[in-house]
Amino acid sequence: QAGPLPKPTLWAEPGSVISWGNSVTIWCQGTLEAREYRLDKEESPAPWDRQNPLEPKNKARFSIPSMTEDYAGRYRCYYRSPVGWSQPSDPLELVMTGAYSKPTLSALPSPLVTSGKSVTLLCQSRSPMDTFLLIKERAAHPLLHLRSEHGAQQHQAEFPMSPVTSVHGGTYRCFSSHGFSHYLLSHPSDPLELIVSGSLEDPRPSPTRSVSTAAGPEDQPLMPTGSVPHSGLRRHWE
């Protein structure tokens, strides 16, 4: 008796964070024996879509010509071979930006900060929101989620960084969201360039800061120190 069929790989092009109205293609890659591919969306009762494999049969394409709120969510795919259905793929979280107006991102006291000092990035929304995300350009993951404790709506979230090192330098954006759908984000804030000057300490991070030098700092979540912001928001690490 053969073991279970290997699970397929699921990904999105050009990526899994898509602006409203833009096109996105979801790919599911299985094996050369695949007869049919099926895409399931969380909380969708019927199979969300199904497609014949593309030659040479090891993958299928699911096209979304124009991104809307309805497409945002969590997907898994499967393939069917002559011996049955595969295990489900790892989930793909398709996020839509542009659902709400853009927040404002600023740095306190200033976006120009000396190494070893402290800085707080402040993300402010015009309307009350309960989730804020801070993104660093070219980072593999969102740096930080801040989510309100009990669904309380907030106009802002603080992202304290202390002590600052050269790793913290770069271009940041923030997004705001409502808790009822973490897959719907605001337009991105205008970019904020954080410039770290001087060397009050060795700019290379120490291992205690949970930044892997092997992978490179851009591949790791940023781990700012300091107290949890007093805004009633709770920190969630990615």
Epitope: R35, P45, A46, P47, D49, R50
Partner: antibody, heavy 120, light 107 residues
């Protein structure tokens, strides 16, 4: 019990369009794909396409891509098929059928069919 | 597209007979084969799905078998109400395709 209600007949002129309906009852409409099948007089069955009522996703037989458009109205649990630029070749009985979606990919419940006659 | 062929377009049998209707696919369809009954009034019903599984409410005198490209539907004890046309259909790949049908008549 599962029921798919289709009007009995439609008489249409050549070059015109017709929108056929299929009203579902007895089950959760958005939980099952819906198929449309064509049968010319004295002929076999031809699969036109399928639609997912929960999100409007469709798959078509290449042969019918420029002829048929499948849509749904979730509020009334009704599936529709619009046929455009009708000719005598489109005179046929059109069935809607519910997808079983498990082993076999069968169509487990069928409507009574709508007879479309294209004539001037 | 997968071509489904029912070589026998019509078949005459007596009540009580055992009747077998065959269907061939142009390629392996991995048991994704279904059988339908169409009555003279046009009513279509699913009989068998996935080669051999009986759909709910279908009498046990109907059975299906086969694998790869060759499949068959058997009616073990023909009754008057079985007078109909029988279609096979493959669900292995899109587009779904049907056989041409076998019309069953009483001798």
């Amino acid at each position: 019990q599962v029921q798919l209600q289709q009007p009995g007949a439609e008489l249409v002129k050549p070059g015109a369009s017709v929108k056929l309906s299929c009203k579902a009852s007895g089950y959760t409409f958005t939980s099952y794909w819906m198929h449309w099948v064509k049968q010319r007089p004295g002929q076999g069955l031809e699969w036109i396409g399928e639609i997912n009522p929960s999100n409007g996703r469709t798959n078509y037989n290449e042969k019918f891509k420029s002829k048929a458009t499948l849509t749904v109205d979730k509020s009334s649990s009704t599936a529709y098929m619009q046929l455009n630029s009708l000719t005598s070749e489109d005179s046929a009985v059109y069935y809607c059928a519910r997808d079983r979606y498990d082993e076999g990919n069968a169509m487990d419940y069928w409507g009574q069919g709508t007879s479309v006659t294209v004539s001037s | 597209d997968i071509v489904m062929t029912q070589t026998t377009s019509s078949l005459s049998a007596s009540l009580g007979d055992r009747v077998t209707i065959s269907c061939r696919a142009s390629q392996d369809i991995t048991n994704y084969l279904n059988w339908y009954q169409q009555k003279p009034d046009g009513t279509v019903k699913l009989l068998i799905y996935y080669t051999s599984r009986l759909h709910s409410g279908v009498p046990s005198r109907f059975s299906g078998s086969g694998s790869g490209t060759d499949y068959s539907l058997t009616i073990s004890n023909l009754e008057q109400e079985d007078i109909a046309t029988y279609f096979c259909q493959q669900g292995d790949t899109l587009p779904r395709t049907f056989g041409g049908g076998t019309k069953l008549e009483i001798k």
